[in-house]
Amino acid sequence: AIVFIKQPSSQDALQGRRALLRCEVEAPGPVHVYWLLDGAPVQDTERRFAQGSSLSFAAVDRLQDSGTFQCVARDDVTGEEARSANASFNIKWIEAGPVVLKHPASEAEIQPQTQVTLRCHIDGHPRPTYQWFRDGTPLSDGQSNHTVSSKERNLTLRPAGPEHSGLYSCCAHSAFGQACSSQNFTLSIADESFARVVLAPQDVVVARYEEAMFHCQFSAQPPPSLQWLFEDETPITNRSRPPHLRRATVFANGSLLLTQVRPRNAGIYRCIGQGQRGPPIILEATLHLAEIEDMPLFEPRVFTAGSEERVTCLPPKGLPEPSVWWEHAGVRLPTHGRVYQKGHELVLANIAESDAGVYTCHAANLAGQRRQDVNITVATVPSWLKKPQDSQLEEGKPGYLDCLTQATPKPTVVWYRNQMLISEDSRFEVFKNGTLRINSVEVYDGTWYRCMSSTPAGSIEAQARVQVLEKLKFTPPPQPQQCMEFDKEATVPCSATGREKPTIKWERADGSSLPEWVTDNAGTLHFARVTRDDAGNYTCIASNGPQGQIRAHVQLTVAVFITFKVEPERTTVYQGHTALLQCEAQGDPKPLIQWKGKDRILDPTKLGPRMHIFQNGSLVIHDVAPEDSGRYTCIAGNSCNIKHTEAPLYVVDKPVPEESEGPGSPPPYKMIQT
C-alpha cells in the first residue's frame, strides 16, 4: 500500500516570493509522484517545478497558482494510485493602478458646485486601506467638503469648488506591502473671479526700426486688471512711459505696440493679469532684435568629372534662423536634378566640366542678407601640348626639355632622371609650365628623363633620352709650365676628347719643326735626351672635322734637378751649447733652402737671436734648450722641383764627470762640442 508520510497543506503565500508544497511517499515498490492543479497535471517550469516529491515555487503568482493542488503517487507495476489531501494558497498581494474620474463621466462635465468622485484603482489581498492626497498633502474624512467612502476607495467632493483644484493621488497598504497610484488625476475647477489666460504674448523678432506687437488677454468675473512691465520692472502705460520706451502704446484689449524698435528696447516684457481673487498671472515674452552675422569664407574646391560632390553652406549665426539657398549664374538651384540643393548642401551629381564656375550661397533673415561665393573647378586629365623629345644637348651649355601640358587646374609637373625625382638646384630648374632646364650640361647628363603631369583627375607621362654632344676639350688641360730634367728622357702628354676622336699634334710656338730626337707620338711629346735647346714654348693642337681645333700652350723649362751635396745628420747637443745642422743643395735653377722645425716653417725674418740660417743653407741654433729637440727638415726647391731631407736633434743634460773617468775619455755618443 502507498502511504503519504508528508502531505501538502494549505498556507499563506506572498506574491512573487518562494513557497513549497511538501509531499513524501512510502511504498513497497517503485512509485512515481506527480501533481495536479484543479485536476490537471502540473508541468515543470523555471518558476514552478517538482523538487523530489514536493512542488517548489520560485515566485508565487496569484493568477497561475490560484486553485487546488494535489499530490498523486502511482505504482506503475500494480497500477495502484494514492492522492494526497487538497492544498491551496492564500496569496497576499497588492498592485498599483491609476486614479480615475468615476463621476461625472468626463472631465468636460466638471463644473463648480457639482459633485466629483475619484476612484483609487489599487487592488490587493487582503483588501488594503487607502490614503488620499491632494498636491502631496494627505486628506482625511470629514474635512472641508469631501468624504472618503466605500472602504476609502472612493473620494467624493461635494460640492467641488476652485479650492479643490489640484493633483490627486492615492496610496494603499496591506499586510503584503504598500503601493501608490501609477497615474494621478489633475482636477481643475476654475474660480471665475480668478484671472485666466485668454491670449498669451509670444516672443517677437523684429528688424531694427521696425514695429513689434505683443498681444495679451485675461478673463475673469469681474474683469481682471492688466499691466505691462519691461525688464527693469518699469510699468508701461500710455500716461507714464519710461524714457527708453517713448514709442510704446498699450491698447484697450491689452496689446502692446512698440514702434521704431532700437537695441535698447530688446528684452523681456511681462504682462500681469490680476483677478478679484487668486494670485496674479505673469506672462513673459521676449523682444529680440533681428541680427545676421557674416558668412565664413569658402575654400576653392577642385572636383573630378563623373564624381558626386557636396558643398555645405554653414548658415551665419542669426536671429531669426536665416534661410539658406544656393545660386549659380544668378539662378536659384532647384531641390532636385543633377545639380541641386539639399538642405544647406549644394549637390553636384555626375559632375561635368561645364559645372565649373562660381556658386553662391545666400543666407537671409529680417536683419538682411549675406552671400559667399565658392569657386568650383572641375579637374581634367592633362593633355599634351609638347612632349619631351629625344635631344642632343651641347656640353657646357644650357639644355631644355619640354613637358608642356594643359589641364584644369594647372597641372603639377615633376621630372625624373634615371627614376630619381629631380630637385630644383643650381644645375636643374623646373619652370612652372613644366620645362626642365639643365643649366650647364655635363657628359653624365646623357641619360633617360621622364616627366609626369598630374591633376586630381589623373596623370600623363612621357620620357626622352638625352645625348650629350661633347665639346672639343683637353682631358686634362696640359700644365702651362712644365720642367724637364737635363740629359734625361722626358715625356709631355696631351690628350683631348670631342664628338669625334680628335687628332693631336705638337709644334714649337715659333713654328719651327721639332728636332729629330723629339717625337710626337699620338699626342705625347717624347724627348729621348733633354738638351738645353729643348727649353721653350710648345703648342698642343687638338682638332676634328666638326669642331675645328683647340690649342694649349706649354712653356718647357730644362733644369738640373735638385740633389743634396750635404745633408743634415742626427745630432745630439748638450743643453746650453750650439747646434749646427748642415744642408747644401745643387741644381739649375739654383735651389733655395728652407728649414722646417717641429712641423712649422722657420721664417728667416722671424727667427730671433738664437737661430740663424747661413747663405750656404746650414742652420745654427745657439744656447739650445730641451724644447728645441725634434725633427728638422731641410727643403731645397726651385721652379722645377722640390726635395727634402731630415734629421733629428736631441738636446741632453751635460753629465757630471765621474772620478774614474779621465779627462781624455770620449763621451758615450756623437757630440758637437763648442
Partner: antibody, heavy 117, light 111 residues
Framework: QVQLQQSGAELMRPGASVRLSCTAS????????LHWVKQRPDQGLEWIGR????????EYAPNFQGAATMTADTSSNTAYLHLNSLTSGDTAVYYC??????????WGQGTLVTVSA | DIVLTQSPASLAVSLGQRATISCRAS??????????MNWFQQKPGQPPKLLIY???NQGSGVPARFSGSGSGTDFSLNIHPMEEDDTAMYFC?????????FGGGTKLEIK
C-alpha cells in the same frame, strides 16, 4: 645665380598698411610661382599664399584671405605683398620664395615687419 | 586644412649619434605616387633651407647624413651622425594641397 632680394625692415603703427617687395634676379618670375611665408618671432612658419606672376592668379591660405594681397610686376621682375589694417599679430618676418614644382628650393632673406603703437 | 604634428618639440643629441624627428599628417599627403612631404632646416636669422623633398629625396648640396622616409601620414627625418653644424630648427611641410602647411618645428641641440 638665382636670388630673391627683399625690401628692408618696416616699423608700422597699428591700423596702417605696408607693402613688401621681393625682386628676383637670375630668372624670369613669369616662369615660376612665387610664395609668401610668415614667421612670427620664435614661432613656426605659416604659408600665406602663392601667385603666378604671368597671369596674376593667386591662392591664399584661409587665415590670410582678405588680410593679405599678393601682386607681381613682371616688367621689374618683382613680387609684392600688401598687408592692411596691421595689428600686433602681424609682427613677423615675411619671406618670399620660388617654386617651379612643389618644393621651395629658393628663399629671400626675409623682411621684418614690426607693428607697435 | 592638412595639420602636421611634429615631435618632439625639442631634442638634444650627442655628437656622432642619431637624431630622429617625426611628422604626422592629419590625412595622407600622397598623390600621383609621390609623398608631398618636405623637410627644412632653419638657423637663427636665416631663411629655411630645403633638406629633403618628396619625403626621401635630398636637396641640392645637402650632406648624406640627412635622410627622410615615410609615406601617407607618417614621416621622419634622420640625421646620423650628428654634427655641431646641425644645431637648428627643423620643420616638416606638406605641399599636397593648398593651403600648404608646416609642422610646429623641432629644436635640435647638442647634448
Amino acid at each position: 645665380q638665382v636670388q630673391l632680394q627683399q625690401s628692408g625692415a618696416e616699423l608700422m603703427r597699428p591700423g596702417a598698411s605696408v607693402r613688401l617687395s621681393c625682386t628676383a634676379s637670375g630668372f624670369d618670375i613669369k616662369d615660376y610661382y612665387l610664395h609668401w611665408v610668415k614667421q612670427r618671432p620664435d614661432q613656426g612658419l605659416e604659408w600665406i599664399g602663392r601667385i603666378d606672376p604671368e597671369d596674376g592668379d593667386t591662392e591664399y591660405a584661409p587665415n590670410f584671405q582678405g588680410a593679405a594681397t599678393m601682386t607681381a610686376d613682371t616688367s621689374s621682375n618683382t613680387a609684392y605683398l600688401h598687408l592692411n589694417s596691421l595689428t600686433s599679430g602681424d609682427t613677423a618676418v615675411y619671406y618670399c620664395s620660388r617654386t617651379g614644382t612643389r618644393w621651395i628650393a629658393y628663399w629671400g632673406q626675409g623682411t621684418l615687419v614690426t607693428v607697435s603703437a | 586644412d592638412i595639420v602636421l604634428t611634429q615631435s618632439p618639440a625639442s631634442l638634444a643629441v650627442s655628437l656622432g649619434q642619431r637624431a630622429t624627428i617625426s611628422c604626422r599628417a592629419s590625412e595622407s599627403v600622397d598623390n600621383y605616387g609621390i609623398s608631398f612631404m618636405n623637410w627644412f632646416q632653419q638657423k637663427p636669422g636665416q631663411p629655411p633651407k630645403l633638406l629633403i623633398y618628396a619625403a626621401s629625396n635630398q636637396g641640392s648640396g645637402v650632406p648624406a647624413r640627412f635622410s627622410g622616409s615615410g609615406s601617407g601620414t607618417d614621416f621622419s627625418l634622420n640625421i646620423h651622425p650628428m654634427e655641431e653644424d646641425d644645431t637648428a630648427m627643423y620643420f616638416c611641410q606638406q605641399s599636397k594641397e593648398v593651403p600648404w602647411t608646416f609642422g610646429g618645428g623641432t629644436k635640435l641641440e647638442i647634448k
